[in-house]
Structure formats: C-alpha cells, structure tokens
Interface confidence: low
C-alpha cells in the first residue's frame, strides 16, 4: 500500500464567548485537514480525534466518527471543530482576552490531531501536532494557513 498523507492546514475559524461570573472563555475552534489517498483503492477515514492544549493543559477534545471515504488518488479537505474552555487556574487570561487596550489577543495553542483510516480491514493512524495562534478576543475567520504566522502578544505581568 502507498501512503495516506495527512496535512494539518490550520485554524479556519475561532468563535469566542464568555461567562462573566465564572471568568471563563469558550472558544470553538474549527480546524482544516487535507487527507490525500495515494493508493489505487478507496480508504475510509474512520475517525478523527483532536485535542487542544494551552500552556501544557488540555483545554478541549473532540472525536469525529465515520467521516468519509476517499477515492483512489484523491484528496479531501475535512473541517473539524474542537470546543475549548479556558477557566479555573487559567482565568487570568480572561482579562487579556477581553480588555480593549490590548489590540491583539492572540494566544498560542497546540493542536493535536490523530486520523484513523481503514482499508481492507487494515487500520492506520497518523498524528500531527502544530502550534497555532488564535485570537481569544473576537470571532475570527482565518485564511487557510494564516494562523500559523501571526505574532503572539504575551500579556503584561
């Protein structure tokens, strides 16, 4: 069998909401993957498991099942959304993400994704990790790959 290539493209959008009482930030982060089937037979994308880390803490997980079938020598772009919560010991980020005098509210998130494909009863897992910058201060739609190159503004201590 030839390879199945998984390429993490980046963050497609991030939608933010806040809980005032809990000093909590909710970020729904939609990511984009390109999965290429280099074989002369179809493969099934059985599931995608993803998690997001902020400051070495897992802030969100997602799992998609029975996603799609990719035909021979074909490529499919797949979007998946990870709901994340920044709270509790990270509630200090609340000020950073909402204060007007901070213009760029980018935070560094580590995106981890594992794609499980199957063909002829054989299962294969491919994992990727990538650091991305996400604006936690407003709803943002990114051009593909854009979130990788933004400068991150660390909050003043």
């Amino acid at each position: 069998p030839r390879s199945i290539d998984v390429k993490y493209i980046g963050v497609k959008s991030a939608y933010v909401s806040y809980d005032v009482q809990k000093r909590t930030i909710y970020l729904n982060i939609t990511n984009t993957l390109n999965i290429t089937n280099n074989n002369y037979y179809s493969v099934e994308v059985e599931n995608i498991t993803a998690q997001v880390q902020f400051s070495k803490t897992v802030i969100g997980k997602a799992r998609l099942n029975n996603i799609t079938i990719i035909g021979p020598l074909d490529m499919k772009q797949i979007d998946y959304t990870v709901p994340t919560v920044i709270a509790e010991e990270m509630s200090y980020m609340y000020d950073f993400c909402t204060l007007i005098s901070i213009k760029v509210h980018n935070i560094v998130l580590m995106m981890q994704v594992t794609v499980t494909t199957t063909y002829f009863g054989h299962s294969e897992q491919i994992s990727q990790e990538r650091y991305q910058y996400v604006d936690c201060g407003r709803n943002t739609t990114y051009q593909l790959g854009q979130s990788e190159y933004l400068n991150v503004l660390q909050p003043q201590q």
Partner: antibody, heavy 118, light 112 residues
C-alpha cells in the same frame, strides 16, 4: 525607576503650534500606552488621547481630534503631543501618563504649563 | 461617549473621621469579563494626579489601606477612613471601559 520627564513650561504665540515632549525611562517604552491629559487653570482633568509606542496606534477624544497630534520617537523613548492653532483655551498644564496593557495608570509626568500669549 | 459625573464639587471633613466621595457614569462600566473599569485619582495642590484605586475596588501600589473603592456598574464610591491632613486635594474618577476615556469633574476634599 520609572520616570516621565516633561519640560516645565512653554510660552507660545497665539495661532502658532507647539510640540511638547515626554521622555520615558526605567521601563520598556513600547510595552505601555502613553496618554495625554489637559488641565486648565483651576479646572478638572480632560483626557486628550493615547498612543501605543510599539506601532503608533492612536485614539483621540473627539474634542481634541483637530487640535492634538500624538507621536513617538522610539529611538529616544519620547512621546510628543503637537498642539496647533493655539488660542487662550489651550493655555493649560499638559500631563503625560503611562498605562499598561492591563490598566494601571501608574506613572504621570510633572506636566508642562503651556501659556498662549497674544 | 461615557459621561462621568461627580455631583459634589467639595466635601469637608474633620481629621480622623471618615468621608465618602461619589461618582456616577452614564452607562455601566462593568465589562463582559467581570471587571469594572473605573479609576480614582488624587491630585494634591500643585502636583500631578496619583492613582489610588483601579478596577473600581483595587488599591494601587503604595496607597494606604484607609482608601477603599466600591460600587455597582454605574454608581461608585471612594471611602477614606481616618482622614489625615495629607489627604486634602481633588479626587477624580475616570472610566477606561471604552474610548474616549473620561474623567469626572472632581471633588475637592477640605479639612474642617
């Protein structure tokens, strides 16, 4: 220690312009907003506007949009306010003050007294 | 624009007693993040303003704990307990929730 140094006084002619300076020291100049505040004799404080020295983004009070221009010189860690078409209404003490990305308006200059004479 | 109102131009107090200075805003200064973006400053005669309170109720560095701030989204109070002679001056509130930032007109504290 943090210091914002302003000249004590400026005497300027009616209709002229003046450029006031505020030299910052003791901290990273580009990490803090610089604000300018006006105080007429015996009156209260008025917020003129602020500038981010890192990229020169400015915000102005509508009242001062056509009167004041805020700039910075990063090489000398100095913020400036230029006041144009001066009248007696512009005779006042002008303070600079810094604030962090959070919100502490913690250091103020001593103020420059501008006197407009005819 | 947000308008800040300090209704009392001056208050008079006997040294050692307590005094409250009030301030109102034309709209709520409570941010979505739960903080209320109001400052209190003291300007002593012939001096630059000095930060006393930030985010409505937080004591600034080096300020005696005789000073305290409280309030709701639109009504704010600066309380000074055990007033001392050095507390005389003009007290200003200021909002920095949104641009343009704005000051109250000031309340002068005088000693009886």
């Amino acid at each position: 220690q943090v210091q914002l140094q302003q000249p004590g006084a400026e005497l300027v002619k009616f209709g002229a312009s003046v450029k006031l300076s505020c030299k910052a020291s003791g901290y990273t100049f580009t990490s803090f907003w610089m604000h300018w505040v006006k105080q007429r004799p015996g009156q209260g404080l008025e917020w003129i506007g602020n500038i981010d020295p890192s990229d020169s983004e400015t915000h102005y009070s509508q009242k001062f949009k056509d009167k004041a221009t805020l700039t910075v010189d990063r090489s000398s860690n100095t913020a400036y306010i230029q006041l144009s078409s001066l009248t007696s209404e512009d005779s006042a003490v002008y303070y600079c003050a810094r604030s962090s990305n959070w919100d502490n308006f913690d250091y103020w200059g001593q103020g420059t007294t501008v006197t407009v004479s005819s | 624009d947000i308008v800040m109102t300090q209704a009392s131009p001056s208050v008079s107090v006997t040294p050692g007693e307590s005094v409250s200075i009030s301030c109102r805003s034309s709209q709520s200064l409570l941010h979505v993040n739960g903080n209320t973006y109001l400052y209190w400053f003291l300007q002593r005669p012939g001096r630059s303003p000095r930060l006393l309170i930030y985010r409505m109720s937080n004591l600034a560095s080096g300020v005696p704990d005789r000073f305290s701030g409280s309030g709701s989204g639109t009504a704010f109070t600066l309380r000074i307990s055990r007033v001392e002679a050095e507390d005389v001056g003009v007290y200003y509130c200021m909002q920095h929730l949104q641009y343009p930032f704005s000051f109250g007109s000031g309340t002068k504290l005088e000693m009886k």
